[in-house]
């Protein structure tokens, strides 16, 4: 089972949001297939996505075991129709991925405003806590469970009649803000991990929710 006609994978890229983590690479295979291996810096290699014709491999199950570890993956190229053979000593071409530390590098998914409630001149805005595939004691953890106080939310709020966006911040999933009586407000939230120094400190903004629509309620 020679590897003379296979080309090494390239452009290995981690795509990760809220710990759902996929390794992507090129090229689209012509007469070849791929197998992925992943390990921590000090651990053994584990094979995934055996002899696949895809150019991506979902590695979520592996990285959620310890999201604070640093992982390395590699993609091996084999001829199409390759069958594992004990007699083969030739190592297939492979390419290493960049290192990936999920806790520091997973992108923050778009948050959702769960509800808002007005009581007089106060509005309580609640952000939905997203579930992740990270587990502790056989229980799936939420984004807040994983990041704790490292995760904050920035609320943008503005009068429907105005464009200027005021801000508020919380390290829980709730905001309590002052509003002008009789005015309708709109809201959008953004997840932020301020301690990150990289280009993924912020999530995309949530969809805008406005008072007078079904998500909110008002009490005097």
């Amino acid at each position: 089972s020679g590897t003379t006609n296979t080309v090494a994978a390239y452009n290995l890229t981690w795509k990760s949001t809220n710990f759902k983590t996929i390794l992507e690479w090129e090229p689209k295979p012509i007469n070849q297939v791929y197998t992925v291996q992943i390990s921590t810096k000090s651990g053994d290699w584990k094979s995934k996505c055996f002899y696949t014709a895809d150019t991506e491999c979902d590695l979520t199950d592996e990285i959620v075991k310890d999201v604070k570890q640093t992982y390395l993956a590699r993609v091996f190229s084999y001829p199409a129709g390759h069958v594992e053979s004990t007699g083969s000593t030739e190592e297939p071409p492979y390419e290493n991925s960049p290192e990936f530390t999920p806790y520091l590098e997973t992108n923050l998914g778009q948050p959702t405003i769960q509800s808002f409630e007005q009581v007089g001149t106060k509005v309580n805005v609640t952000v939905q806590d997203e579930w992740t595939l990270v587990r502790r004691n056989d229980t799936f953890l939420s984004l807040r469970d994983v990041f704790g106080k490292d995760l904050i939310y920035t609320l943008y709020y503005w009068k429907s009649s105005s464009s200027g966006k005021k801000t508020a911040k919380t390290n829980t999933n709730e905001f309590l803000i002052d509003v002008d009586k009789g005015e309708n407000y709109c809201f959008s939230v953004q997840a932020v991990i301020p301690s990150r120094r990289t280009a993924n400190r912020k999530s995309t903004d949530s969809p805008v929710e406005c008072m007078g629509h079904e998500k909110g309620e008002s009490r005097e």
Partner: antibody, heavy 120, light 107 residues
Framework: EVQLVESGGGLVQPGGSLRLSCAAS????????IHWVRQAPGKGLEWVGY????????YYADSVKGRFTISADTSKNTAYLQMNSLRAEDTAVYYC?????????????WGQGTLVTVSS | DIQMTQSPSSLSASVGDRVTITCRAS??????VAWYQQKPGKAPKLLIY???FLYSGVPSRFSGSRSGTDFTLTISSLQPEDFATYYC?????????FGQGTKVEIK
Amino acid sequence: EVQLVESGGGLVQPGGSLRLSCAASGFTISQYWIHWVRQAPGKGLEWVGYIDPYNGYTYYADSVKGRFTISADTSKNTAYLQMNSLRAEDTAVYYCARDYGSLRVSLDYWGQGTLVTVSS
Amino acid sequence: DIQMTQSPSSLSASVGDRVTITCRASQDVNTAVAWYQQKPGKAPKLLIYSASFLYSGVPSRFSGSRSGTDFTLTISSLQPEDFATYYCQQHYTTPPTFGQGTKVEIK
């Protein structure tokens, strides 16, 4: 190293316009917030406005609302303050500052400032 | 808008003196208060964040505290390089607001 450098200040007549720039290095502005703060000669600090360059959201002090516009070009890692209908009371040193964006830390890095003088 | 009332507006002190500057917020701002030092012709520099935390590289003679809506900046032993103007700032709500400043001069 985080750095903010303002430019574009100068002498302008009342009613005139000026655009200030705030060039950032050492960090990506879209992942933070940029504020403008001014200081009239011999006076204290006055907040002017902010932008979230990630989504373009802004908010302004009442004293400049409708006259000043903050924008950002993330490809140039630069924020701008467009000042129109300038008045004598807008004379000040204008600083841009980075907002770290946490509950605990706000304006952690400031530029050196640029002087705007509004006079006939 | 939240008002930050800072006092005194100026004070004279000698090297080695203990100096206290106060700021009162017009409503609750939690601990979202920072203190800045500014020297003539220079930009403000962050000294204290979150009411009582010393910013990186700032000498330990500077400290901050909070009691309700009252915030205090203390310089335990004034040094020659500490003669400057000090500002408090709240960032609890938009717009953020500054105190009027306290000029610390040599006696």
